[in-house]
């Protein structure tokens, strides 16, 4: 089909790329997210330094085929789905009728993607169309994150298996850029 990807196994067609973090929504110290400067890791936030045992953010492995229109990946890809209730584990009783239910107090924490990886896949298409070459963005790890009023709730949804084309007037962004130059943009992204 015009290309071959391999290392030791000449049939390999789903090479993986390195992991990298999604840009954080806010950088209080205004440092840039230049990989070469900080290794690609966002600065720690004070509310994330608690004992991890206070949180229950589960990473569920999920295997699926990648599709783009009628085309489907030759092999399935594996990524994580972030699941579970995040602490801190302070719970307050709330009476509803005769029973009680419990809800966390304090800031709203969510279990969300922390790091992503890019994986190159080849999609096989019907009708003699050439296989499509794609790099997909897959969740590599999860973390408990405090939501702020800036966060876009719609972005908590899992990624679909269908390709999302860039919206009109909205520019796809490079995966690593200066936080200072893109502060407003980052406020709506994890």
């Amino acid at each position: 089909q015009g290309w071959q990807a391999f290392k030791n196994d000449a049939t390999e067609i789903i090479p993986e790329l390195g992991e990298y973090p999604e840009p954080p929504p806010e950088l209080e110290n205004n440092k840039t997210m230049n990989r070469a400067e900080n290794g690609g890791r966002p600065p720690h936030h004070p509310f994330e330094t608690k004992d991890v045992s206070e949180y229950s953010c589960r990473e569920l492995h999920f295997t699926r085929y990648v599709t783009d229109g009628p085309c489907r990946s030759a092999k399935p890809v594996t990524e994580l789905v972030c699941s579970g209730q995040c602490g801190p584990a302070r719970l307050l009783p709330n009476a509803i009728g005769r029973g009680k239910w419990w809800r966390p107090s304090g800031p709203d924490f969510r279990c969300i993607p922390d790091r992503y990886r890019a994986q190159r896949v080849q999609l096989l298409c019907p009708g003699g169309e050439a296989p499509r070459a794609r790099k997909v963005r897959l969740v590599a790890s999860c973390k408990c994150k405090r939501l702020t009023r800036f966060h876009n709730q719609s972005e908590l949804k899992d990624f679909g298996t269908e390709a999302a084309r860039p919206q009109k007037g909205r520019k796809p962004r490079p995966r690593a850029r200066s936080a200072k130059a893109n502060q407003a943009e980052l406020e709506n992204a994890y």
Epitope: K7, P15, L17, G18, A133, V136, N152, P166, R175
Partner: antibody
């Protein structure tokens, strides 16, 4: 600043091999794929293949399959492209280029562009 | 392999002119197309990715459009520094083939 610096010009005889190096600086070498592109004098650009510096995985255009090998040395942030069994039509300027990926939040796929290029290495194949 | 063709192969224009270059793919590539500018003796420079998105630092007089098999690069008002060769590249299927280039020179 982000840059790719390639090795110097080479003159080779038909049948020989050439190995061109591409040293990255100003960014994390293992975070971006490297593509190799060549251009014969007065001709258009010709894509040869890509390499993932993190895993060492590669993908080559079928035209070069069996003759080209793309490798890397992460300790010195350098990518290499070796072309063997050289013939006169391989005379060209060889470029390494960084493959940037652009995404829209919530999108499944990345968008492609070669955003940083090496200065080019002229390879002349002549008997 | 997907074949990329460009027209015209060359165009003579004056400063201030509007220039349109067409790129055609031999099969549907959706919006998986990039445009590059190359000046004599220089390295290619990325102008447009995903068919219509302007690369950071590229002047807004450059724009790209199209989807499927037909694409255009438009320079709204040609500047002296824009005289160069422009090439398209498809990134839909391996190998990522380039068009032959369109040379924009001074009339």
């Amino acid at each position: 600043q982000v840059q790719l610096v390639q090795s110097g010009a080479e003159v080779k005889k038909p049948g020989a091999s050439v190995k061109v190096s591409c040293k990255a600086s100003g960014y994390t070498f293992t975070s971006y794929d490297i593509n190799w592109v060549r251009q014969a004098t007065g001709q258009g650009l010709e894509w040869m293949g890509w390499m993932n510096p993190n895993s060492g995985k590669t993908g080559y255009a079928q035209k070069f399959q069996g003759r080209v090998t793309m490798t890397r040395d992460t300790s010195i942030s350098t990518a290499y492209m070796e072309l063997s069994s050289l013939r006169s039509e391989d005379t060209a300027v060889y470029y390494c280029a960084r493959e940037e990926e652009y995404y829209e939040s919530g999108s499944l796929f990345y968008y492609y562009g070669l955003d940083v290029w090496g200065q080019g290495t002229t390879v002349t194949v002549s008997s | 392999d997907i074949q990329m063709t460009q027209s015209p192969s060359s165009v003579s224009a004056s400063v201030g002119d509007r220039v349109t270059i067409t790129c055609r793919a031999s099969q549907d590539i959706s919006n998986w197309l990039a445009w590059y500018q190359q000046k004599p003796g220089k390295v290619p420079k990325l102008l447009i990715y995903a068919a219509s998105y302007l690369q950071s630092g590229v002047p807004s007089r450059f724009s790209g459009s199209g989807s499927g098999t037909d694409f255009t690069l438009t320079i709204s008002s040609l500047q002296p520094e824009d005289f160069a060769t422009y090439s398209c590249q498809q990134a839909n299927s391996f190998p990522f083939t380039f068009g032959p280039g369109t040379k924009v020179d001074i009339k």
